[in-house]
C-alpha cells in the first residue's frame, strides 16, 4: 500500500539541514542519526494521520510510533494500532476519532526498534492541525436583479470554520477572493447578466476553535449566468 503524504499549500518543503555537520563524522553511530520528523493532520476531526518520510532512513526501517496526551486522563502510552505503509515500510500511523483529543497536548514518539535509544519525541497542538472537508452543496440564489447570494454547507461545526470564496467571470484572468466568517454565506452585490460566473469555496479551522494554517480542498465549482462567446483558457485550466 502506497500512501500519499500531504504537504498542503506547498509551504512545508524546507529540507532539513540536519546536524551531522555538528558532530565529528567518525563518532557517528546509528543511535545519533536523526529520525525523520512526524507531521500530523486531523481530517475533519474524524481521523488523524501522522506521517514521516520513511525514505530518509539510510536503510529500510520499520520505525514504530507511540503516543500519549500530556497532563490528562489519556496519558497512558499507546502503541500505534493502524500503521500506514510506503513500499512495505511503515511511514505513518492513523488514529481514529475516539483517540483524538483536540485540546490536550499530543505527544508522539518515533523509535527505531532495532536501536531503542534512537527515538524522537514531539509535542503537537492538534487544534492547530485540523483540515476540514471541502465545502459542499453550493447553491446560488438571486436576491435582486443584480445581487447574488452564495450558500454552502460544511460537514463540521460551522462556528469553528472561516471560509474563503473565490469568484471570476469568463472574462477575468484571475480570481477575486473574499474572506467570510463562520456564517457560510456570501453576497455579490453587482452581477453582470451578460457574463458567466464561477464560484468556489474553501474552509479553515480558525480562529474560534483552533489556529489551523491549512485550508480544506476547494469545493466543486458552481456556475451562474450565460455562456460568453469569449472563451477564456484560464478558466478551463483552473477547473481541470
Amino acid at each position: 500500500l502506497n500512501t500519499t503524504i500531504l504537504t498542503p499549500n506547498g509551504n512545508e518543503d524546507a529540507t532539513t539541514d540536519f546536524f551531522l555537520t555538528s558532530m565529528p563524522t567518525d563518532s557517528l553511530s546509528v543511535s545519533t542519526l536523526p529520525l525523520p520528523e512526524v507531521q500530523c493532520f486531523v481530517f475533519n476531526v474524524e481521523y488523524m494521520n501522522c506521517t514521516w518520510n520513511s525514505s530518509s532512513e539510510p536503510q529500510p526501517t520499520n520505525l514504530t510510533l507511540h503516543y500519549w496526551y500530556k497532563n490528562s486522563d489519556n496519558d497512558k502510552v499507546q502503541k500505534c494500532s493502524h500503521y500506514l505503509f510506503s513500499e512495505e515500510i511503515t511511514s505513518g500511523c492513523q488514529l481514529q476519532k475516539k483517540e483524538i483529543h483536540l485540546y490536550q497536548t499530543f505527544v508522539v514518539q518515533l523509535q527505531d526498534p532495532r536501536e531503542p535509544r534512537r527515538q524522537a519525541t514531539q509535542m503537537l497542538k492538534l487544534q492547530n492541525l485540523v483540515i476540514p472537508w471541502a465545502p459542499e452543496n453550493l447553491t446560488l440564489r438571486k436576491l435582486s436583479e443584480s445581487q447574488l447570494e452564495l450558500n454552502w454547507n460544511n460537514r463540521f461545526l460551522n462556528h469553528c470554520l472561516e471560509h474563503l470564496v473565490q469568484y471570476r467571470t469568463d472574462w477575468d484572468h484571475s480570481w477575486t477572493e473574499q474572506s467570510v466568517d463562520y456564517r457560510h454565506k456570501f453576497s455579490l452585490p453587482s452581477v453582470d447578466g451578460q457574463k458567466r460566473y464561477t464560484f468556489r469555496v474553501r474552509s479553515r479551522f480558525n480562529p474560534l476553535c483552533g489556529s489551523a494554517q491549512h485550508w480544506s480542498e476547494w469545493s466543486h465549482p458552481i456556475h451562474w449566468g450565460s455562456n460568453s462567446s469569449k472563451e477564456n483558457p484560464f478558466l478551463f485550466a483552473l477547473e481541470a
Epitope: 512545508e12 536523526p34 514531539q122
Partner: nanobody
Framework: QVQLVESGGGLVQAGSSLRLSCAAS????????MGWFRQAPGKEREFVAV???????FYADSVEGRFTYSRDNAKSAVYLQMNSLQPEDTAVYYC????????????????????WGQGAQVTVSS
C-alpha cells in the same frame, strides 16, 4: 552551523525571578525549533520548554505557569523568564536548536537537537 550562547544565570533566593537569554549566531532562527533544557547534578537532562518555528510552545509539568518562553527572531535570541523559583529548579540550563522542515515540529527529546549552548548555572537557595 549555529552557535548558541546563554546568559542570565546566577544565585537567587527561593521565590525570586531570573531571565535567561540565548543568543544565536551563524544563521537566523527561522526554521529552527528551539528548546530550553536543564540538568541537575546526577540527573538526566530534561526538557523545560520547547518551541516550534510555527510558534507553538510547550512546557514541562514542573514549570508550567511559572516559566515563560519567548523568541525574538529579529534579534536572533530566545528567552526563558523564570518566576517563583524553587530550590528544585537548581540546574545548568541549556539552550538548544534543531533545524526542522515543518512549522509544527517541537521536540521534547534532547537527542533531537543539533546545536547546544554551553549552559548557564542557576542556583536557587532556600
Amino acid at each position: 552551523q549555529v552557535q548558541l550562547v546563554e546568559s542570565g544565570g546566577g544565585l537567587v533566593q527561593a521565590g525570586s525571578s531570573l531571565r535567561l537569554s540565548c543568543a544565536a549566531s551563524g544563521r537566523t532562527l527561522s526554521r529552527l525549533a528551539m528548546g530550553w533544557f536543564r540538568q541537575a547534578p546526577g540527573k538526566e537532562r530534561e526538557f523545560v520548554a520547547v518551541n516550534s518555528w510555527g510558534g507553538d510552545t510547550f512546557y514541562a509539568d514542573s514549570v508550567e505557569g511559572r516559566f515563560t518562553y519567548s523568541r525574538d527572531n529579529a534579534k536572533s535570541a530566545v528567552y526563558l523568564q523564570m518566576n517563583s523559583l524553587q530550590p528544585e529548579d537548581t540546574a545548568v540550563y541549556y539552550c538548544a536548536a534543531a533545524p526542522t522542515s515543518f512549522a509544527t515540529t517541537a521536540y521534547s527529546s534532547s537527542n533531537s537537537y543539533a546545536y547546544w549552548g554551553q549552559g548557564a548555572q542557576v542556583t536557587v537557595s532556600s
